[in-house]
C-alpha cells in the first residue's frame, strides 16, 4: 500500500526510538570510518525531518524515497573524498545506482582499531552518566565493524547490553556479574554477524532463488507439520525481510520482521507446536526466539517420497508445468523428513534431482531414466557423514587448540597465498566446529557441522573477495554456494606455490607475549605456525609439531625468566636457528 510519505510511515510504524537506532546503524554500516559524533548529528537531523513529515505528510521533500533522503544526507559529509576515496563518486550518481554504489563499498574488514574493553568501573560510570549515548555508541561500534549485521537483531543485542549494565552496575561484584555477560554477547554477536553475512552473500552473489531454496529447506526442517503453502508464504516473507536488510533498507526490514513475527504467532497452530514460549516474549526477544526455535516433531506416518517424485507417471508433467514449485515441493518433503541432514546437503540433493529431471524428461523413456535417481543421493549423503566422523575423532583426540592447528596446516597448504591473519581467523573458526558440534548425537551432528562450516567458509570468501590472491579460493567461492565446503575439502596441497622467503623478524618475539590472554597467545603461536608452513609447505606434521613444541617451551621459559626481554632475544635466535635446521630452511 502506497504512503504519501515513506519516512513518516516508517517513523510511525517503528516509533522514535527504533527509528533513530536503525538510522544510526544504517549510516554506520555505510560510512564505517566516520566519527560517532558526526553520525549522531546526521541521525538527529534525519529524525527532526521525519517528525515534520509525521506532522504533515505533504511537507517539502516528505514524498522522497528513503534512499534519496538518506543518500542525500550521507553525501553532505564534508570529508567524504579524503576519508573514503572513490566512494565519494557514489554521490554523483542518481538513485537507485547511488545506493548500489554505497553497498558495493561496504568493507567486511575495515581498518578500525580493536575494541578494547575499559575497566568495569569506567564503563559503569559512562553508563550512568549518559545511558543514551552509551547505548548509541554500542550500536555504532558494532555496526561499523559489521556492515551486514542484521539490524533488528542488533536492537535485541543492544537491549541485552543495556540490561547487563543495569543489573551489574549495582551488583556487589560488578566485574563478576558483567564480564561473563559481555563475553557472551561478544561471542554471540560475532556468530550472528557471520550467519547474516552468509544470507547476504547468498542473496547478492547467487540471487533470490538460491536464498529461497535455502529458506525452504531450513523452514521445512524446523516446521515439518506446516503445509507446503504455509512454508512458501513464510519463505516469501523471510526473503523480503533479508533482501531489505542486506540492501541497506533497515527501516523496512525491521518493520517487516515485526510483521512476520506477529503473523507467525497468530498462526502458530498451523506452523509449529514449539512456538508457544517464543510468542509470549516481548517483540525483540520474540523475533530472536522464533529465529532460533528448535525443530518441531515430524508428523507420524509420512508416506515414502518415491511415490510422488519417482514412481508417479506424472513426474515430468508436474515438473514441466511449474518447475520451481515442483522442486520446492521436493525440497520441502525431503527436508521435513530429514532434520538430520544439513541444509546444504538437502540443496545438493535437490540440485541432483533437478539435473536428473532436466536430462530424463527429454529422454525417450523418462521414467526408466529417472527411476534410480534416489540411488545417486547415497554418495552425496555419505561424504559429509564420513568427513564429520573423521574430524570429530580427530577433535576428540587433539582438543580444540591442536585441532585448530591441524586445520591451520591443512588450509595453509591448500591456499598458501591467503593472508596469514585471514588463515588464522578462518582456521580458528573452522576448528570451533569440534566443540560446537561433536558433542551432539549423530542425528544432530551434520546440520550443526556442515551448516556452521558454510558460515565460516563464507567469511573466507568475503575476506578474499576484497583482495583476491588465489584462483582456487575464487573458484570454490563462486562456482556453487552449496558446494563450497566440498570444493575446499577436495583441495590438495598447492603444488604451484613458491615458498615464502624466510624472514627472521616474523619469528621474533618479545616479553609482551607474556601479558597476553591465553587466546591472544594462541593466536601469536598460530600466526607463527602459518608462517612456518608458508616457508616450508612440504614440512611434515611431525616436523611442524616438533618446532611448535619447542616454541611453546621457549615462550614458557622466557615468561618465567627474570630478564624476560633478554631471554626472548637470546633464546629466540637459538630457536630460529634450530627451527631452520629442523625444517631444512
Amino acid at each position: 500500500d502506497a504512503h504519501k510519505s515513506e519516512v513518516a510511515h516508517r517513523f510511525k510504524d517503528l516509533g522514535e526510538e527504533n527509528f533513530k537506532a536503525l538510522v544510526l546503524i544504517a549510516f554506520a554500516q555505510y560510512l564505517q570510518q566516520c566519527p560517532f559524533e558526526d553520525h549522531v548529528k546526521l541521525v538527529n537531523e534525519v529524525t527532526e525531518f521525519a517528525k515534520t513529515c509525521v506532522a504533515d505528510e505533504s511537507a517539502e521533500n516528505c514524498d522522497k524515497s528513503l534512499h534519496t533522503l538518506f543518500g542525500d544526507k550521507l553525501c553532505t559529509v564534508a570529508t567524504l573524498r579524503e576519508t573514503y576515496g572513490e566512494m565519494a563518486d557514489c554521490c554523483a550518481k542518481q538513485e537507485p545506482e547511488r545506493n548500489e554504489c554505497f553497498l558495493q563499498h561496504k568493507d567486511d574488514n575495515p581498518n578500525l582499531p580493536r575494541l578494547v574493553r575499559p575497566e568495569v568501573d569506567v564503563m559503569c560510570t559512562a553508563f550512568h552518566d549518559n545511558e543514551e549515548t552509551f547505548l548509541k555508541k554500542y550500536l555504532y561500534e558494532i555496526a561499523r565493524r559489521h556492515p551486514y549485521f542484521y539490524a533488528p537483531e542488533l536492537l535485541f543485542f543492544a537491549k541485552r547490553y543495556k540490561a547487563a549494565f543495569t543489573e551489574c552496575c549495582q551488583a556487589a561484584d560488578k566485574a563478576a556479574c558483567l564480564l561473563p555477560k559481555l563475553d557472551e554477547l561478544r561471542d554471540e554477536g560475532k556468530a550472528s554477524s557471520a550467519k547474516q553475512r552468509l544470507k547476504c552473500a547468498s542473496l547478492q552473489k547467487f540471487g533470490e532463488r538460491a536464498f529461497k531454496a535455502w529458506a525452504v529447506a531450513r523452514l521445512s526442517q524446523r516446521f515439518p507439520k506446516a503445509e507446503f503453502a504455509e512454508v512458501s508464504k513464510l519463505v516469501t516473507d523471510l526473503t523480503k525481510v533479508h533482501t531489505e536488510c542486506c540492501h541497506g533498507d533497515l527501516l523496512e526490514c525491521a518493520d517487516d520482521r515485526a510483521d512476520l513475527a506477529k503473523y507467525i504467532c497468530e498462526n502458530q497452530d498451523s506452523i509449529s507446536s514449539k512456538l508457544k514460549e517464543c510468542c509470549e516474549k516481548p517483540l525483540l526477544e520474540k523475533s530472536h526466539c522464533i529465529a532460533e526455535v528448535e525443530n518441531d516433531e515430524m508428523p507420524a506416518d509420512l508416506p515414502s517420497l518415491a511415490a510422488d517424485f519417482v514412481e508417479s507417471k506424472d513426474v515430468c508433467k508436474n515438473y514441466a508445468e511449474a518447475k520451481d514449485v515442483f522442486l520446492g515441493m521436493f525440497l520441502y518433503e525431503y527436508a521435513r523428513r530429514h532434520p538430520d541432514y544439513s541444509v546444504v546437503l538437502l540443496l545438493r540433493l535437490a540440485k541432483t534431482y533437478e539435473t536428473t529431471l532436466e536430462k530424463c524428461c527429454a529422454a525417450a523413456d523418462p521414467h526408466e531414466c529417472y527411476a534410480k535417481v534416489f540411488d545417486e543421493f547415497k554418495p552425496l549423503v555419505e561424504e559429509p557423514q564420513n568427513l564429520i566422523k573423521q574430524n570429530c575423532e580427530l577433535f576428540e583426540q587433539l582438543g580444540e587448540y591442536k585441532f585448530q592447528n591441524a586445520l591451520l596446516v591443512r588450509y595453509t597448504k591448500k591456499v598458501p597465498q591467503v593472508s596469514t591473519p585471514t588463515l588464522v581467523e578462518v582456521s580458528r573458526n573452522l576448528g570451533k566446529v569440534g566443540s560446537k558440534c561433536c558433542k551432539h548425537p549423530e542425528a544432530k551432528r551434520m546440520p550443526c557441522a556442515e551448516d556452521y562450516l558454510s558460515v565460516v567458509l563464507n567469511q573466507l570468501c568475503v575476506l578474499h573477495e576484497k583482495t583476491p590472491v588465489s584462483d582456487r579460493v575464487t573458484k570454490c567461492c563462486t562456482e556453487s554456494l552449496v558446494n563450497r565446503r566440498p570444493c575446499f575439502s577436495a583441495l590438495e596441497v598447492d603444488e604451484t606455490y613458491v615458498p615464502k622467503e624466510f624472514n627472521a623478524e616474523t619469528f621474533t618475539f618479545h616479553a609482551d607475549i607474556c601479558t597476553l590472554s591465553e587466546k591472544e597467545r594462541q593466536i601469536k603461536k598460530q600466526t607463527a605456525l602459518v608462517e612456518l608452513v608458508k616457508h616450508k609447505p612440504k614440512a611434515t606434521k611431525e616436523q611442524l609439531k616438533a618446532v611448535m613444541d619447542d616454541f611453546a617451551a621457549f615462550v614458557e621459559k622466557c615468561c618465567k625468566a627474570d630478564d624476560k626481554e633478554t631471554c626472548f632475544a637470546e633464546e629466540g635466535k637459538k630457536l630460529v636457528a634450530a627451527s631452520q635446521a629442523a625444517l631444512g630452511l
Partner: nanobody, 122 residues
Framework: EVQLVESGGGLVQAGGSLRLSCAAS????????MAWFRQAPGEEREFVAT????????YYADSVKGRFTISRDNAKNTVYLQMNTLKPEDTAVYYC???????????????WGQGTQVTVSS
Amino acid sequence: EVQLVESGGGLVQAGGSLRLSCAASGRTFSSYAMAWFRQAPGEEREFVATISVSGGYTYYADSVKGRFTISRDNAKNTVYLQMNTLKPEDTAVYYCAAGDSSSWLEHMYDYWGQGTQVTVSS
C-alpha cells in the same frame, strides 16, 4: 517485566473531560515508550496516542488530535491521557501499553494493562 494498572475511567457527558492514569510497577518505567489504545464493543483495538521514552515525541490518532493529550511523569512511574471535548464515539475500554519504541502499531508493544472503561453519554 512491567505491570500496568489503568484508572480514571467512568461515565461522562458528551463535551466533558476525563483524565486517565496508568501506573507502572518497576524501576525501568523510564526506559519504556508508552501508549494508549482503545477498544469499542465489537470493534478491533485501535491506537489512540503514544509518547516516547524521552517524552519529546508524541503522536495521536487523527480522531483524537487536538482533544486528547498524552504525558508522562517518570518520577511517579505514571503515564496520563487527558481527554477533553469527549464524544459518544470515544466510548471504549482504554488500555495502557509499554514497549521499546513509540509506535502506533499494537504488535510493537510488549506489556499491557487490563483496561479501564470510558462511557460518553449523549
